[in-house]
Amino acid sequence: KTLVLGKEGESAELPCESSQKKITVFTWKFSDQRKILGQHGKGVLIRGGSPSQFDRFDSKKGAWEKGSFPLIINKLKMEDSQTYICELENRKEEVELWVFKVTANSDTHLLQGQSLTLTLESPPGSSPSVQCRSPRGKNIQGGKTLSVSQLELQDSGTWTCTVLQNQKKVEFKIDIVVLAFQKASSIVYKKEGEQVEFSFPLAFTVEKLTGSGELWWQAERASSSKSWITFDLKNKEVSVKRVTQDPKLQMGKKLPLHLTLPQALPQYAGSGNLTLALEAKTGKLHQEVNLVVMRATQLQKNLTCEVWGPTSPKLMLSLKLENKEAKVSKREKAVWVLNPEAGMWQCLLSDSGQVLLESNIKVLPTWSTPVQP
């Protein structure tokens, strides 16, 4: 008995070969002897039943001259899994067709952190093994269900599942979209008074995107977090529902989500969490955003540089006179110089030598007041 593996919804070709390598009479039947189709000597394909009943069944007329009389079954269904009989030259050939199906749990659009379950449906009597490969090359194998917990952004793309049965294999491709922001976290460094822009690009594209979102902000100086803005997203159009009066944020009306803070002030420095709840999805997308604000000031004989917001302990804050060695450099959030020399002073926030933020302040001779460029 010949075994053919097929995929639900696709086509299968069941072979039937003549030893004569020429056109001959043949008939394809179900195992209960009902005729499917055949050729009875006139080179014409005769179907065994009503056209609607047998419209999925066909043969390759072009192959008949070479002694090949395949049965083509289109739009395969699970119930097509059975034995088919090819009768020719006073002999019968049995061909077993097994139709398989691999599906993803409920939806192929899943939130980051959710689980993906791939299920194999197979015909009775079969004992296939299945192995699936993720877009990032990770292999998972198992029985009829395979699960991946904690989906990551890199799991977005085409999953390839290979079903193996009796040394034959059939491959399934399933497109999975992991719904997430491109970045889990971002940090913005600004001088006091500068305009701040926050961007929240999504890592996926869909034709219609509907949901609602909110940005909660925990200022470093505040005891509790505060909702800065709430918005709706309908068919990729953003509309602001409510915005705090301080700060007065502006939000773009189209994707990617984009917010503008008129100016960076020490009281705004801190961390935010933007959440986006998508329609018909359980759970939310999250992106953390951090704001670090720098201020350089001169009061009487003291030149001070301060930063506010979430800085890592390895960041260095320095004060230096232009083109000279740093006068003071500390892993702290404030540095100062007493009785600074006249000239252009630079306050630098750096990470392993890379400058993240810079603020200049001009110190005038002692009889003058400082100028901030």
């Epitope: 502006q250 773009g252 009306k253």
Partner: antibody
Framework: EVQLLESGGGLVQPGGSLRLSCAAS????????MSWVRQAPGKGLEWVSG????????YYADSVKGRFTISRDKSKNTLYLQMNSLRAEDTAVYYC????????????WGKGTTVTVSS | AIQMTQSPSSLSAFVGDRVTITCRAS??????LGWYQQKPGKAPKLLIY???SLQSGVPSRFSGSGSGTDFTLTISSLQPEDFATYYC?????????FGQGTKLEIK
């Protein structure tokens, strides 16, 4: 061919009302954002009001908020601007404009209709 | 509302000249900006959308650049039909706002 045709302009006294219409053809009217833009004699362009595509949210310039109402009739492929409590400074040519897919600029404009507010 | 400051307000140039018009937004608007051309008695016409994308059917001598707050419209080689008034429009969010316009005149 994509076309917009405004109508309903005319002379009206201060405090009066007018309703402008914009008949759209050649595109799926309900899918696109639409706007009204005006131009006072010898002056620049001023955006007046807008309505989003599938959602139908409405927006207004501060100068007309509370006096003008934008709406659309999808069955008639028509955009409207109801103008109440009209003032002399509302005198202008009013244009209807269609926005491109995903808000890629106002790609189609009507020829305009003139509104004159005078006693 | 976002303010759009366009400069210069008027400009005289010769046919064949390269001209540049600038537009500055009062806050960051990404690339959500369009440039429009208007001739006397006519409706405006879209030239550039999304700051730098050329609208279909518009000659390639027109180009746009910029993002955030500063934007530029450049006409590489002025043609007689380019003498008109040019406007920028922010469509970052509602209410939309136009620049004051730049009248481009023939020298």
């Amino acid at each position: 061919e994509v076309q917009l045709l405004e109508s309903g302009g005319g002379l009206v006294q201060p405090g009066g009302s007018l309703r402008l219409s914009c008949a759209a053809s050649g595109f799926t009217f309900s899918s696109y954002a639409m706007s009204w833009v005006r131009q006072a004699p010898g002056k620049g362009l001023e955006w007046v009001s807008g309505i989003s595509g599938s959602v139908g949210s409405t927006y207004y310039a501060d100068s007309v908020k509370g006096r003008f109402t934008i709406s659309r009739d999808k069955s008639k492929n028509t955009l409207y601007l109801q103008m109440n409590s009209l003032r002399a400074e509302d005198t202008a040519v009013y244009y209807c404009a269609k926005e491109g897919y995903d808000w890629s600029g106002m790609d189609v404009w009507g020829k305009g209709t003139t509104v004159t507010v005078s006693s | 509302a976002i303010q759009m400051t366009q400069s210069p307000s008027s400009l005289s140039a010769f046919v064949g000249d390269r001209v540049t018009i600038t537009c500055r937004a009062s806050q960051g608007i990404r690339n959500d900006l369009g440039w429009y051309q208007q001739k006397p008695g006519k409706a405006p016409k879209l030239l550039i959308y999304a700051a730098s994308s050329l609208q279909s059917g518009v000659p390639s001598r027109f180009s746009g650049s910029g993002s955030g707050t500063d934007f530029t419209l450049t006409i590489s080689s002025l043609q007689p039909e380019d003498f008109a008034t040019y406007y920028c429009l922010q469509d970052y969010n509602y209410p939309y706002t136009f620049g004051q316009g730049t009248k481009l005149e023939i020298k």
